[in-house]
């Protein structure tokens, strides 16, 4: 682990200390800047990122400190060692003095952050533009007007057809210079990310002709998440939400297409619920059926009246301190109408417990209740909108008879968690059950449903 | 008819800890259905919670205060105590002890103790 | 922490008016709001809980409202010995909260 850089294990001993960031938690590193100000944006250097972690899990929270002392969550971030990760902050609105970076990853480096200003912030009145100087590989011309002014674009018209040159950009501020930008290598009469057609052979998915991140195209031309790209050069759109369920979102968007059922799968939703807090004000019964797709799950949310109780159950009858001291246990029934051998349960979220008070991912409980009211447990899990609905695949023991399931417990231990549907996934047109009960000379017709009578034809 | 009834020194030096206790009588501070806190009131001004039991033991402090409060609970005494160290001037109040319910609001109330920090 | 701001800080009024006084929450704390009466050299005595509920044996003429970050306590009658100091206070989440207060004098 670098010097110059901070990770949570660089000061502990690998054999002697347990992982240095524990669920749920973790560390934080907190930093203060020189001047406080109102943001624009954060962008922050990650130089080392655990594979366990791949780029979701490791920076579980952000948070700016305000100087009028609130916390403002930014919340989990994607973040990759070979580009800085920049956070727009348009809707801050007041002047921040540091900043917190949760993680779980105690592996995880941190080599620097940036606060950038909004524009005219009055620390800026004595400074001086930037300008920038372009450096290639074969090296320039001389006569070459290399150091850009107010425009930022440079053209190069040395070029010869099939050449490789790689460009790099230094930043010039008075006397000082910048290190050289990372090196972008162009092969001249090919394509390239930025020229508005897609080369599906240097692994584009798309062009918009700009190197802006959140428009849809990445500055890899990469199709971003909740965006479809069509046409050259790209124009994308977040079809997300859009109320078209489209082919390639069928199984990514709830709010368009509904719950995805994959093929050779049937979804039940439940037919009844029974809960263990309930009023006029958070009845049970609002988690039979499917769950309404405007229902988006929210994260960090406090007060739970705000119109959830319509499409979610949630425990309104305790408050969350009483419940946190007291420990009390929640929970929740789901009967199906048709009993089946499960594939899968599946959890529909609108909140997932968590608060800004506490870094702690809410776990639920969930357990399989099955026609002879035996119970079999599926475990423990952690709740999160980033894994909504969440899909709980039941893995049945092949040396114990397989058994119909007729309804689905889940408890839980925060009022803070409100549950809009839970479904019981089984197979369709194939029961296990009546499979291994099926008698010498018999065979499962799936049309059935049933063990039918065969005889072999010689 | 619960009743609460809070005890302790009326003065204490800075930079000492303050002990204080609070007496149940009339039910059973083991009941699941509440919880147990102290509340301040400095002279004039308004009501800060300070802390809160179940009678399991398990807490949650004022994080304001977190570093110098300890609360703690004795059901075979129908007792839970408060202790806050390291008190300066800041700290002279009236010191009540209450009930919460699952609605976390305080429906019993100790006559209150004032507590004076000087030396 | 939740901040709970109340208004008025004091008010004037006479026998028999109606009284109202508000309190807002920084952030939406659901229904989990109480409020409470006290006088001086008292320990404060509850009026209502979850924001609408009127503890047992407090006079039918307080009564609470609100959800979410705005909250009502309302005297429909003052009657004299409802001159005193009026706390809203906020269960939604630790640390629990209190709004400064607003005293209720005689005009």
């Known amino acids: 682990s670098s010097v110059r850089t901070w990770s949570p294990n660089s000061a502990v001993n690998p054999h002697t200390v347990p992982p240095a960031c524990p669920e749920p938690q973790g560390c934080y590193l907190e930093l203060e800047f020189l001047y406080p100000l109102v943001p624009e944006s954060l962008t922050i250097w990650v130089t080392f990122v655990s594979t366990d972690w791949d780029s979701s899990g490791a920076v579980n929270d952000i948070k700016l400190l305000a100087v009028s002392g609130k916390n403002i969550s930014l919340g989990p971030q994607n973040v990759f060692c070979d580009v800085p990760l920049t956070i727009r902050l348009w809707d801050v609105g007041e002047e921040v003095y540091g900043i917190q970076i949760y993680t779980l990853d105690e592996h995880l480096e941190i080599d620097a952050a940036m606060l950038t200003s909004t524009a005219d912030t009055p620390l800026c009145l004595q400074c001086k533009p930037l300008k920038y100087k372009v450096v290639r590989d074969p090296p320039l011309q001389m006569d070459v007007a290399s150091i850009l002014h107010l425009n930022r674009k440079f053209v190069d018209m040395d070029l010869n057809l099939g050449s490789v040159y790689q460009y790099w950009v230094i930043t010039i501020s008075g006397t000082e210079e910048s290190e050289p930008s990372p090196a972008v290598t162009y092969i001249h009469g090919s394509g390239y990310c930025g020229d508005g057609i897609i080369q599906k052979d240097q692994g584009e998915q798309c062009d918009d002709m700009n190197k802006i991140n959140g428009d849809g195209c990445s500055l890899f031309c990469r199709q971003e998440v909740s965006f479809n790209c069509i046409d050259e050069p790209s124009r994308c759109y977040f079809h997300d939400g859009d109320g078209v369920c489209e082919e390639f979102e069928q199984k990514t968007s709830i709010k368009d297409c509904g719950v995805y059922t994959p093929q050779g799968f049937l979804d039940q939703w439940a037919s009844n619920a029974s809960v263990s807090h309930q009023d006029q004000q958070c009845p049970g019964w609002v988690i039979i059926g499917q769950p309404a797709a405007s229902q988006v799950c929210r994260t960090k949310v406090i007060d739970l009246s705000e119109g959830i109780s319509q499409h979610a159950w949630y425990p309104c009858t305790i408050s969350y301190p009483y419940s946190q001291l007291a420990q009390t246990t929640f929970w929740l029934r789901a009967y199906f109408s048709q009993p089946m051998v499960a594939a899968a349960v599946i959890v529909h979220l609108v909140t997932d417990g968590t608060y800004y008070g506490d870094q702690k991912q809410e776990t639920i409980s969930v357990q399989l209740l099955d026609t002879k009211d035996q119970s079999h447990d599926l475990g423990l899990h952690v709740l999160s909108c980033r894994n909504n609905p969440l899909i709980i695949p039941v893995v049945h023991d092949l040396s114990q008879p397989f058994y119909h399931s007729q309804a689905v417990r889940v408890s839980f231990s925060s009022p803070l968690v409100a549950i809009s549907g839970v479904a019981l996934r089984s197979f369709d047109n194939f029961d296990p059950v009546t499979l291994s009960s099926c008698q010498r000379g018999e065979t499962y017709s799936p049309a059935e449903q049933s063990c039918v009578h065969f005889a072999c034809e010689k | 008819q619960l009743q609460l009834q809070e005890s302790g020194p009326g003065l204490v030096k800075p930079s000492e800890t303050l002990s204080l206790t609070c007496t149940v009588s009339?039910?059973?501070?083991?009941?699941?259905?509440?919880?147990w806190g102290w509340i301040r009131q400095p002279p004039g001004k308004g009501l800060e919670w300070i802390g809160s039991?179940?009678?399991?033991?398990?807490?949650y402090y004022n994080p304001s205060l977190k570093s110098r409060v300890t609360i703690s609970v004795d059901t075979s005494k129908n007792q839970f105590s408060l202790k806050l160290s390291s008190v300066t001037a800041a700290d002279t109040a009236v010191y009540y002890c209450?009930?919460?319910?699952?609605?976390?609001?305080?429906?019993?109330w100790g006559q209150g103790t004032l507590v004076t920090v000087s030396s | 922490d939740i901040q709970m701001t109340q208004s008025p800080s004091s008010v004037s009024a006479s026998v028999g008016d109606r009284v109202t006084i508000t309190c807002r929450a920084s952030?939406?704390?659901?229904?989990?709001l109480a409020w409470y009466q006290q006088k001086p050299g008292k320990a404060p005595k509850l009026l209502i809980y979850?924001?609408?509920s009127v503890q047992s044996g407090v006079p039918s003429r307080f009564s609470g409202s609100g959800s979410g970050t705005d909250f009502t306590l309302t005297i429909s009658s003052l009657q004299p010995e409802d001159f005193a100091t009026y706390y809203c206070?906020?269960?939604?989440?630790?640390?629990?909260?209190f709004g400064g207060g607003t005293k209720v004098e005689i005009k």
């Open positions: 952030q939406g704390i659901s229904r989990w």
């Open positions: 979850a924001a609408s």
């Open positions: 206070q906020q269960g939604n989440v630790p640390p629990l909260t």
């Open positions: 039991i179940f009678y399991s033991g398990s807490t």
């Open positions: 009339g039910g059973s501070i083991s009941s699941s259905d509440y919880y």
């Open positions: 209450a009930r919460a319910t699952t609605s976390s609001s305080a429906d019993y």
